[in-house]
Interface confidence: low
């Protein structure tokens, strides 16, 4: 079928189209165009014979149109009135017609559209603004974008006159944004500049800067005003009711406690007419005096005096606070504080009290802290020590002994021999000894503060031949794989070697034993029961040897694993069952059995008469070390038979 | 005397955090209001943050400071903390902690600080 297709089917002002013919016929005369739904010979265009390829314009003819063999027929320069039907009238050689209809339309190429506002400058909660896409344009879709999106779902846009004006109700501050329009028809789209939206709002509340509304007597007040506002907020500020001046900042150099009161600043846009205004409380703080701290006993004795440290001065409505070596109070019984924490009481000092100690006033901006006290404690004299700790000396050297005796203040010493007064130092010198230098030492410490004395005395044996030695031990009964034991070689001689021996031999080779304090003293590490020994010490020097009586180690140990005997289970019925239970243990252990469960008796044998078959079952002895601590036990089946019914052993 | 060390500070570029610390072994800071302080050179030391004695419950910030710095302490490591998020040039400085709130001059000792530099 014959059929006219507008290539394209909308057409822009001053384009061309093409309608192209489908299905033409063959065996042709000609054809003609027709402006209009049918074939009108006032409407006719253009008219083509094929046998003379000749086109004869007609009455509809503007010039713009051009046909081709193929009957399709191209319009140039298109105009707004060349929109509607064309008709194509063929006629077959035979001279039968045909005829088909096509159609386009023509639109104008669209200008670039502005946006006109009916409210330059609307005022936030208050105005509403309306914007109208310009110019209005016949067969155009207006559409709207707020900041390059689609406008958003909101009660507060509406869409009118066709979607060409954009109505914004009750403006917000947040509608300040880049509003365009854009024009479409079917041959074009435009967009128009972008129109921001000036929203007077404000002033808000405004807020004041610095938060803090505490200050010191001395100090530089400024404060600082911004209030939310389009245009930019004017701002006064206020002090107790008064006007100080229109800035934005408020700045008062060092403040006198007069300072203090209500500071407001208000906030003013010219174009709302609106005004705000926010209050600040200031209070301004007189610099509090640095504290310092006074004691009731400036030198308390030890264990006897008790010492009161207040910090001064007294100011109503403070904190007060107490350091020790910086750090926060211990909990102690020994310390107090008073109920307005002014005064912390030491009682019954110690020379460890000495502190240092420091007190503070906390006021409402800040901890002052005093000087640091120290505590002046008397103590003392502890009982003195004479050094070195050698008993005996030979003849010819030098004795030279030093006593000291923990004490504040520093102890006074005096020296007496036999009980006779020598000298008032701390050293005593006796140059070349002899025998005669032999007897007791005694050193006197004095505290002149406390007038307390403590002696401590020391036997000097000068003598060429070395005395007898003796063993002391730190545990005269060590627990095997539990406990050491320290032997030590009696007296400290000077310039003498000491010697061990274990049942007469040199000492072994052992991990577990350990020489030291000059080889005086033998440490044996985790003893076991081989250790119980004869232990022997010896000394010498140039001139003479000595040894020890033995000292046997007597460790504790065990219980072992009891072992029941005789080892036989089965009996004959009518046999006596006679049990022996023997477990190694020091001391010997104590022995208890128990059959079947049930408790029998404290003895290390078990005797039962002519035992018969009510006699089966299990047999358990138990023993326990009280020294060591330790508990063991075994357990053994009996099995008894009657007379000849089984092999067996009798008793 | 008492001995204030501060730390944390350093090179970040504009936008970025930083957090400083600030501790002491010779004071224990549980009693004191503690506060931030920051000098530019030629400039008097101002004060950023303060937080209220033990529990820190009362914090105030300047306006330069507010929204962006937190301060914090933690009583058990006796430290006291800067959080500073979208930091900008002009924030350079050299930051100190110290007692005493507002009444800068009045602090016993100043730390050695620790140096903050932002750049664009």
């Known amino acids: 079928k014959l059929t006219i297709e507008s290539t394209p089917f909308n057409v822009a002002e001053g384009k061309e189209v093409l309608l192209l013919v489908h299905n033409l016929p063959q065996h042709l005369f000609g054809y003609s165009w027709y402006k209009g739904e049918r074939v009108d010979g006032n409407r006719q265009i253009i008219g083509y014979v094929i046998g003379t390829q000749q086109a004869t314009p007609g009455p509809a003819y503007s010039g713009r149109e051009i046909i081709y063999p193929n009957a399709s027929l191209l319009i140039q320069n298109i105009i707004q009135n060349d929109t509607g039907f064309y008709t194509l009238h063929v006629i077959k050689s035979d001279l039968v017609n045909e005829e088909a209809t096509g159609q386009f339309r023509v639109y104008p190429e669209l200008p670039k559209p502005s946006i006109s506002s009916n409210n330059s400058k609307p005022v936030e909660d208050k105005d509403a603004v309306a914007f109208t896409c310009e110019p209005e344009t016949q067969d155009a879709t207006y559409l709207w974008w707020v900041n390059n999106q689609s406008l958003p779902v909101s009660p507060r846009l509406q869409l009118s006159n066709g979607n060409r004006t954009l109505t914004l109700f009750n403006v917000t501050r947040n509608d300040t944004a880049s509003y365009k329009c854009e024009t479409q028809n079917p041959v074009s789209a435009r967009r128009s500049d972008s129109v921001i939206l000036n929203v007077l709002y404000g002033p808000d509340a405004p807020t004041i800067s610095p938060l803090n509304t505490s200050y010191r007597s001395g100090e530089n007040l400024n404060l600082s005003c911004h209030a939310a506002s389009n245009p930019p907020a004017q701002y006064s500020w206020f002090v107790n009711g008064t006007f100080q001046q229109s800035t934005q900042e408020l700045f008062i150099p060092n403040i006198t406690v007069n300072n203090s009161g209500s500071y407001t600043c208000q906030a003013h846009n010219s174009d709302t007419g609106l005004n705000r205004t926010t209050v600040t409380t200031i209070t301004v703080y007189a610099e509090p005096p640095k504290p310092f701290i006074t004691s009731n006993n400036s030198n308390p004795v030890e264990d006897e005096d008790a010492v009161a440290l207040t910090c001064e001065p007294e100011i109503q409505n403070t904190t007060y606070l107490w350091w020790v070596n910086n750090q926060s109070l211990p909990v102690s019984p020994r310390l107090q504080l008073s109920n307005d924490n002014r005064t912390l009481t030491l009682l019954s000092v110690t020379r460890n009290d000495v502190g240092p100690y420091e007190c503070g006033i906390q006021n409402e901006l800040s901890v002052d802290h005093s000087d640091p006290v120290i505590l002046n404690v008397l103590y003392g004299p502890d009982d003195p020590t004479i050094s070195p700790s050698y008993t005996y000396y030979r003849p010819g050297v030098n004795l030279s002994l030093s006593c000291h005796a923990a004490s504040n203040p520093p102890a006074q010493y005096s020296w007496l021999i036999d009980g006779n007064i020598q000298q008032h130092t701390q050293e005593l010198f006796i140059s070349n000894i002899t025998e005669k230098n032999s007897g007791l030492y005694t050193c006197q410490a004095n505290n002149s503060a406390s007038g307390h004395s403590r002696t401590t005395v020391k036997t000097i044996t000068v003598s060429a031949e070395l005395p007898k030695p003796s063993i002391s031990s730190n545990n005269s009964k060590p627990v095997e794989d539990k406990d050491a034991v320290a032997f030590t070689c009696e007296p400290e001689a000077q310039n003498t070697t000491y010697l061990w021996w274990v049942n007469g031999q040199s000492l072994p080779v052992s991990p577990r034993l350990q020489l030291s304090n000059g080889n005086r003293t033998l440490t044996l590490f985790n003893v076991t029961r081989n250790d119980a020994r004869a232990y022997v010490c010896g000394i010498q020097n140039s001139v003479s040897a000595n040894r020890s009586d033995p000292v046997t180690l007597d460790v504790l140990y065990g219980p072992d694993t009891p072992i029941i005997s005789p080892p036989d289970s089965s009996y004959l019925s009518g046999a006596n069952l006679n049990l022996s239970c023997h477990s190694a243990s020091n001391p010997s252990p104590q022995y208890s059995w128990r059959i079947n469960g049930i408790p029998q008796q404290h003895t290390q044998v078990l005797f039962i008469a002519k035992i018969t078959p009510n006699n089966n079952g299990t047999y358990a002895c138990f023993v326990s070390n009280l020294a060591t601590g330790r508990n063991n036990s075994i357990v053994k089946s009996i099995t008894v038979s009657a007379s000849g019914t089984s092999p067996g052993l009798s008793a | 005397e008492v001995q204030l060390v501060e730390s944390g500070g350093g090179l970040v570029q504009a936008g970025g955090s930083l957090t400083l610390s600030c501790t002491s072994s010779t004071l224990t800071f549980t009693p004191y209001r503690m506060g931030w302080y920051r000098q530019t050179p030629g400039k008097q030391r101002d004060l950023v943050a303060d937080i209220s004695p033990g529990d820190g419950s009362t914090k105030n910030y300047a306006g330069f400071a507010q929204g962006r710095f937190t301060i914090s302490r933690d009583n058990i490591k006796n430290t006291v903390y800067l959080q500073m998020n979208d930091l900008k040039p002009e924030d350079t400085a050299v930051y100190y902690c110290?007692?005493?709130?507002?009444?800068?001059?009045?602090?016993?000792?100043w730390g050695q600080g620790t140096q903050v530099t932002v750049s664009s």
């Open positions: 110290n007692t005493y709130v507002a009444f800068v001059g009045r602090a016993r000792t």
